[in-house]
Interface confidence: medium
């Protein structure tokens, strides 16, 4: 076949710095890609939270559709791919549970999607019914193997790979999903998550025997694994990834995200090929745009592109927007419905949560742990037992005198930032530094004071900053009867915390710099609302998770009274 020359938008070509023509005999493919959209069906603010000023909002499926259609009209061979984690992130998922994903991805005519870890958040049934059965595009993962009765139930609903006709050629797409999914979500016991590289190689080999010589690995295991796949899986030409929310860009980035590398990121494979690897940040803020030239043998000759910022200069498609507005009605009704009741005052005041243990902090941490219950090993009652939460992230109390009713709206006031509760792995020494930071300038009503779950901490404020943690006990995981043991500095621990802390917020740079692993979790409000719905009636107490002491108790009480008084004066005069 003799392909037409590419007709990329002029602005994009200028941004790339050159007009790039395909080589003679080459075949050009345009890959449009999204990842980690996390229920951002409507446009959002620049930081991917709720849209406030519409003239400055970004993303959303209506705007995405406009840009996709524009490129489909201008270029001959276009694929629209998603690398997983459409599920989980806003009230859209809470209410529609995945039906919204199938509906709007069908409307945008996605060509393929890889399963992400969050696609299993509502169990296998919550994936099969709303998405796998409703999607009009292939959903892929080569390293998930079903066993037992589930094997026949799920058979054919997702595939290891799919060969797609594109123009006069065929392209193979092979999927993969993080093997950590059993620790990050709820896939149940009848799905086995194999090593990505081990599982991908035979599927790619199979595609090669089918004379498919252009192969894209599309998946959700994070940028490090994406690069390893590019390096180690023979026959993969391009890797389109997700999970790590990686932003890559060539040239001057158009918004606040700082590039982790150039787009595409080029990996030299073990057999000497240059393999482009891409991601498109997250939350539907960008549309990944990658142009690949293949020779007649399916080798990549060149690759170039950049993520396209979906800002307000791109109009929202009116028909998709109208559909969004129609689906929105149910959300507005939901946010005022009762989720459960509290029979105690939920103290989320800054006067409490930034100075001492507060029961709102305890409630949120308990919800965070409950959301991460995964009994994956007989020797462990759970894989994680600890939670930390910056007191400054708790923005409002909830009064029990309103008939005890708790609504989504109430919780949105407590947790207004639209963050996630993530899973990290840290050395004990890092955790100790974090608790020292928690009180390094105690008494100034600052946000870094930590609320906790599965942790008992004792501070001595008479000691100098950096040396105030006198006791730090943590709840065991490898035990049948959970109990508290002293923190071991060299042990590696799993901890649930807000993504804000994982990213070094409130001065917790040591967490960002020293974390050994970071997996993004569920929407903060969703975690707490699910817990409250499950418990029906809640009564969190202040129960001695955080204590203060000094050498003499009298001195300790005096110090604490003095500091508390000082704090109240400080707050009153702000």
């Amino acid at each position: 076949m003799c392909p037409r020359a590419a007709r990329a938008p002029a602005t994009l070509l200028l941004a790339l710095g050159a007009v790039l023509w395909p080589a003679a005999g080459a075949w050009e493919l345009t890959i449009l890609h999204t990842n980690d959209v996390h229920s951002r069906l409507e446009q959002t603010s620049e930081d991917s939270s709720k849209c406030v000023n519409a003239s400055r909002c970004m993303g959303g499926v209506a705007r995405l559709f406009t840009k996709v259609q524009q490129i489909r009209r201008a270029e001959p061979n276009v694929l629209l791919l998603d690398a997983g984690d459409q599920y989980q992130g806003t009230i859209w998922f809470t209410v529609y549970k995945g039906a919204e994903v199938a509906h709007f991805m069908n409307a945008l005519r996605y060509d393929a999607m890889a399963l992400g870890n969050h696609e299993f958040d509502n169990g296998v049934e919550g994936l099969i019914e709303p998405l796998l059965k409703e999607a009009k595009f292939p959903i892929l993962s080569a390293n998930i193997k079903a066993k037992g009765p589930l094997a026949s139930q799920i058979s054919g609903l997702y595939l290891p790979y799919k060969v797609l006709p594109v123009g006069d050629e065929v392209v193979g797409i092979v999927g993969y999903t993080s093997k950590e999914t059993p620790f990050l979500s709820n896939p149940g016991t009848n799905l086995v998550f194999e090593d990505e590289i081990t599982a991908l190689q035979p599927e790619v080999d199979k595609l090669k025997t089918l004379n498919v010589n252009k192969i894209i690995a599309l998946g959700h295991s994070g940028f490090e694994m994406d690069k390893l796949i590019a390096q180690k899986v023979r026959g993969v030409d391009v890797v389109v990834g997700g999970h790590s929310n990686t932003f890559l860009y060539t040239g001057n980035p158009p918004s606040k995200e700082v590039p982790a590398g150039k787009y595409p990121f080029i990996v030299t494979s073990d057999d000497g090929r240059k393999v482009p690897v891409v991601q498109a940040y997250a939350f539907g803020k960008y549309l990944g745009y990658l142009k690949i030239e293949f020779d007649e043998r399916g080798n990549v000759i060149s690759s170039h592109g950049n993520p396209i910022l979906l800002n307000s200069s791109i109009p929202e498609d009116p028909s998709i927007k109208a559909d969004i507005n129609k689906w929105r009605i149910k959300l507005d009704n939901y946010s005022t419905q009762e989720l459960g009741k509290t029979i105690v005052y939920l103290d989320g005041s800054s006067q409490s949560c930034r100075f001492r243990e507060c029961n709102m902090g305890n409630l949120i941490c308990d919800a965070m742990i409950n959301n991460n219950l995964r009994h994956t090993d007989e020797m462990f009652w759970n894989h994680v037992s600890m939670c930390i939460l910056n007191g400054g992230g708790i923005r409002s109390p909830i009064d029990e005198r309103n008939n005890g009713t708790i609504t989504w709206e109430n919780l949105a006031a407590v947790l207004p930032f639209g963050g996630t509760f993530d899973l990290v792995q840290l050395k004990g020494s890092t955790l100790k530094k974090a608790f020292e930071h928690s009180v390094h300038r105690y008494g100034q009503s600052t946000g870094e004071f930590l609320q906790v779950g599965g942790i008992h901490v004792v501070y001595d404020l008479s000691r100098k900053p950096g040396d105030r943690v006198v006791k730090l006990d943590v709840l065991c995981t490898k035990c049948r009867v959970p109990s508290y043991d002293p923190l071991k500095m060299d042990e590696v621990y799993k901890v649930i915390l807000p993504n804000f802390l994982a990213n070094g917020g409130d001065g917790f740079q040591m967490i960002k710099d020293e974390l050994l692993r970071h997996d993004s979790g569920d929407q903060d409000i969703n975690v707490v609302s699910t817990y409250i719905s499950k418990m029906k009636v809640i009564y969190p107490a202040v129960e001695g998770r955080i204590k203060f002491s000094t050498g003499s108790h009298c001195h300790g009480s005096f110090s604490l009274i003095f500091l508390s008084l000082w704090a109240v004066i400080f707050v009153l005069y702000q």
């Epitope: 093997k179 620790f183 390893l228 090993d377 792995q425």
Partner: antibody
């Protein structure tokens, strides 16, 4: 292909210091941790520590904390280990090794090793 | 520190037979999931080479004659059928907890 190049031998006097180098090629240097492992003649392997080339973060085996200092030079894709106050106990082969991603950093590529001989 | 004890310290196996090497950890190296135990082969005068990672995953290019199994504290490296080229010292290694530690090694001779 992926390679870690180390000089073959270093002869040093007791009490002196030595800086061992490990030049990485064939992969993105900042995407993998670099580890150092000691092997005394006829003995097993001992993990000294690791360094994250992207931000210089280190983890040390307490046993080597005052003996070894790990550094990286991103501009030359080189990891280094300084050994101080050398004694005959430090005579050994020292390997650098690339650690795979995530929490299960198995050591998938090893340098050929530098033989350090401490002798007056 | 987690102590890894390998047994036997040495063994001689006839060509084509099975070699079994054991590695016992002083505490569990499982992480509520895959065990963080890896196996390396070292031939005289050479650097170690990764054989098996995360208990049972074969590194690329390693023959399928090698296999690994185990969980918690008990792990095994199996070689079957043994070939001439397998004469080497084999080490297990954990990274469940800092400092990472290696077993003392098992020297395999071919009869």
């Amino acid at each position: 292909q992926v390679q870690l190049q180390q000089p073959g031998t270093e002869l040093v006097k007791p009490g002196a210091s030595v800086k061992l180098s490990c030049k990485a090629s064939g992969y993105t240097f900042t995407s993998y941790w670099m580890h150092w492992v000691k092997q005394r003649p006829g003995q097993g392997l001992e993990w000294i520590g690791n360094i994250n080339p992207s931000n210089g973060g280190t983890n040390y085996n307490q046993k080597f904390k005052s003996k070894a200092t790990l550094t990286v030079d991103k501009s030359s894709n080189t990891a280094s280990m300084q050994l101080s106050s050398l004694t005959s106990e430090d005579s050994a082969v020292y390997y650098c090794a690339r650690g795979d991603y995530g929490y299960d950093w198995y050591l998938d590529v090893w340098g050929t090793g530098t033989t350090v001989t401490v002798s007056s | 520190d987690i102590v890894l004890t390998q047994s036997p310290a040495s063994l001689a196996v006839s060509l084509g037979q099975r070699a079994i090497i054991s590695c016992k950890a002083s505490q569990s190296v499982s992480f509520a999931g895959p065990s963080l135990m890896h196996w390396y082969q070292q031939k005289p005068g050479q650097q170690p080479k990764l054989l098996i990672y995360r208990t049972s995953n074969l590194e690329a290019g390693v023959p399928t004659r090698f296999s690994g199994s185990g969980s918690g504290t008990d792990f095994t490296l199996n070689i079957h059928p043994v070939e001439e080229d397998d004469a080497a010292t084999y080490y297990c290694q954990q990274n469940r907890e800092f400092p990472w530690t290696f077993g003392g090694g098992t020297k395999l001779e071919i009869k």
